[in-house]
């Protein structure tokens, strides 16, 4: 018996087609992805093959103005239109709190939404009861398939799930659900979830009875053969893990941003064992036409976005200096504003010992592309912010050793004076450079804001200590020559859309007046 699994993950509100790098589509003939194009391909496969499941492994939320405006209603609407069979909850589904998940998505989705390792407690337990499930058994052709969901247990540090959801260890939570399905004669089981490729592989290895793992969170690109675009494969598709009980378990992921549709064919024997698995992600490029009815619906929903981008978010009473002449050479108040917004967006998980889990921000000056003039009545709009941050990136959370941070700051000024983009703007950091010294030895003082303290203060950076830092995904991926970050980071979790972070902060503050205050000397 053969099953076709079509899968997406980390779509991050790319409802419209995008450019090859998943930013805003400029030249339509070269654009990719989007739900209208995805629908064309899905329907083509559904017509051609008998037993097809369309699955999403989480993080539909967050990433473009679509999410900022529609807050998840767009996800439910278009996933319903595409007739997804199931979705696992990702960490970003909690970005607007539990209410921001329940109302627009859980109550409106016409497909099961899954997570076996999220347990509700207190008053939320009855409110959320039945709105998401640990698993769902689906009839597919003449057989039944069990789909068990899971979500990153780091979600409380990455999003806003509140205090009434407990995120258990994925493997511990999955095993009893899989065991239960086995006793009920469900012998074909897919683990669908959002914890990253390393955890996906562990689930394949450790959870007895799981036949296939469909994952997300780490934006992993797997491919067998010559890859069709710019993404470099992290391994073959499917990636085969030998389980502790000796089975070969295929693990798949489909990069991110709706650029690819994962396509996996699994052959099962009559006892539900995987005999063979093969496939590849399908690049959703312009050779696949956009479905006209979905495209028309997208255009209808688009109208509200255009109106939103010119509305006032808040006011500035000072010039927001985002000029390259400032931000690539010295501390600039636009850099300070953005870093303050980045930290503010990550205020969570205070306890008796920590005022926050993260206090530091770094931001490449080259990523700041425009100033905002306060003389336009002080008005700041989404459109203004899109000029400052035009690349459609995210502000991510990484863990780095102090020694890596020191290297990053040396890199920041290794060729100072040439108006290059690697000059770092900061938050929660005081850095002093001596530019008379030779490159690689110019950082003379590097103090960082404590987190394990009731009164935050600046302490000298410790080379062997592990620090959490918020930074643009561009830097986490080694951009602007920050290879040491990419090579040495100990953990990387993708965060929220850059413009959204700053716009939320400005809306919250209402009036802003960031200063140059001696963070960089």
């Amino acid at each position: 018996w053969e099953l076709t699994i079509l899968h997406t993950n980390d779509v991050h509100s790319r409802l419209e087609q995008t450019s090859e790098d998943s930013s805003k589509c400029v030249n339509a003939s070269r654009c990719m992805g989007g739900v209208a194009r995805l629908f064309t391909k899905v329907q083509q496969i559904r017509r051609a093959e008998p037993n097809v499941l369309l699955l999403d492994a989480g993080d539909q939320y967050q990433g473009t103005i679509w999410f900022t405006v529609y807050k998840g209603a767009e996800v439910a609407h278009f996933m319903n239109a595409l007739r997804y069979d199931a979705m696992a909850l990702g960490n970003h589904e909690f970005d607007n709190g539990v209410e921001g998940l329940i109302e627009p998505l859980l109550k409106e989705a016409k497909f099961p939404i899954l997570s076996a390792n999220i347990k509700a407690k207190g008053p939320l337990a009855s409110q959320i009861s039945g709105l998401y499930l640990p698993y769902k058994v689906l009839p597919v052709g003449d057989e039944v398939v069990g789909i068990v969901g899971y979500t990153s247990k780091e979600t409380p540090f990455l999003s806003n799930p509140g205090t009434n959801l407990v995120f258990e260890d994925e493997i511990t939570a999955l095993q009893p659900e899989v065991d239960k399905l086995k006793t009920l004669n469900v012998n074909k089981i897919i683990a669908l979830g959002h914890s990253g490729f390393e955890t996906d592989k562990l689930i394949a290895q450790k959870v007895r009875g799981v036949d296939v793992v469909v994952g997300g969170h780490s934006n992993t690109f797997l491919y067998t053969g010559n890859p069709p675009s710019k993404e470099v494969p992290a391994g073959k598709y499917p990636f085969i893990v030998t389980s502790d009980d000796g089975r070969k378990v295929p693990v798949v992921q489909a990069y991110a941003f709706g650029k690819y549709l994962g396509y996996l064919k699994i052959e099962f024997d009559e006892r539900g064992n995987v005999i063979s698995s093969h496939g590849n992600p399908i690049l959703l490029n312009s050779s696949i036409p956009e479905d006209p009815s979905i495209k028309a619906d997208i255009n209808k929903w688009r109208i509200k976005l255009d109106n939103y981008s010119t509305q006032e978010l808040g006011k500035t009473i000072v010039y927001l200096d985002g000029s390259s002449q400032s931000c690539r050479f010295r501390e600039c108040n636009m850099g300070n504003l953005i870093c303050d917004a980045m930290i503010n967006n990550n205020l969570r998980h205070a306890d008796e010992m920590f005022w926050n889990h993260v206090s530091m921000c770094i931001l490449n000056g080259g990523g700041i592309r425009s100033p905002i003039d306060e003389r336009n009545n002080g008005t700041i709009t989404w459109e203004n912010l899109a000029a400052v941050l035009p690349f459609g990136g995210t502000f991510d959370l990484v863990q780095l050793k102090g020694s890596t941070l020191k290297k990053a700051f040396e890199h920041s000024v290794h060729r100072y004076g040439q108006s290059t983009g690697e000059f770092l703007q900061v938050g929660g950091i005081h850095v002093v450079y001596d530019l008379s010294r030779k490159p690689g030895d110019r950082v003379v003082k590097l103090d960082v804001l404590c987190t394990k303290c009731r009164v935050p203060s600046y302490d000298p950076l410790k080379m062997d200590e592990i620090y959490k830092v918020i930074l643009p995904n561009f830097l986490a991926n080694g951009g602007d020559g920050f290879q040491m970050i990419k090579d040495e980071l100990l953990r990387h979790d993708s965060g929220d859309q850059d413009i959204n972070v700053v716009s939320t902060y400005i809306s919250k503050m209402k009036v802003i007046y960031p200063a140059v205050e001696g963070r960089i000397k």
Partner: antibody, heavy 118, light 107 residues
């Protein structure tokens, strides 16, 4: 509005077969599975099976396996349930019911009475 | 197969009463439970699915609750037209199984 119209009552002798039809309207036929449920006189409801109109895939209750066949004709938006080797205890009202996205039955046909008597 | 035990099997109540019918599954059914109303000589009518979601057009006096193995159908203020037999169904796994029914009579 969603409607399921079933075929008329049938009388059969033991050992014979019966084929009940269920014509759906008011929705896209291939978007929802169809379940079949029966109810013997004065008794409760009993689930018989499920069919996917997209591909004809069926899941049967083991109790009826080998005796029941569910089919579809998408061009007519009609589902069929055939029960073979009829016995007197197969005398019942047979219902078709559409399932919603959650695979819960939501709209029901009016029922077809099948009487098995020698 | 999962067994569904409904109670009571017979219930007599007055118009305006709050009425509760319970359904117990032989094991956790993951909120995959629906409730049906059947009047004599008629086809069943779906009231609730996923334990607590009301089907469009069903009066709001009907509500469902519960999770795991224990589920409840509540009629907040009984009306004459609610006289019927009520069934629960688990659709968590195959085969789907119904409860034995609760016959509700108006005093």
């Amino acid at each position: 509005q969603v409607q399921m119209k079933q075929s008329a009552a049938e009388v059969r002798k033991p050992g014979a077969s019966v084929k009940v039809s269920c014509k759906a309207s008011g929705y896209t036929f291939t978007d929802s599975n169809m379940d079949w449920v029966r109810q013997a006189p004065g008794q409760g409801l009993e689930w018989m099976g499920d069919i996917n109109p997209n591909n004809g895939g069926t899941i049967y209750n083991q109790k009826f396996k080998g005796r029941v066949t569910m089919t579809i004709d998408t061009s007519r938006s009609t589902a069929y349930m055939e029960l073979r080797s009829l016995r007197s205890d197969d005398t019942a009202v047979y219902y078709c019911a559409r399932t919603n996205w959650d695979y819960a039955m939501d709209y029901w046909g009016q029922g077809t009475t099948v009487t098995v008597s020698s | 197969d999962i067994q569904m035990t409904q109670s009571p099997s017979f219930l007599s109540a007055s118009v305006g009463d709050r009425v509760t019918i319970t359904c117990k599954a032989s094991q956790d059914i993951n909120s995959q439970l629906s409730w049906y109303q059947q009047k004599p000589g008629k086809a069943p009518k779906t009231l609730i699915y996923r334990a607590n979601r009301l089907i469009d057009g069903v009066p709001s006096r009907f509500s469902g609750s519960g999770s795991g193995t224990d589920f409840t159908l509540t009629i907040s203020s009984l009306q004459y037209e609610d006289m019927a037999t009520y069934y629960c169904l688990q659709y968590d796994v195959f085969p789907r199984t119904f409860g034995g029914g609760t016959k509700l009579e108006i005093k």
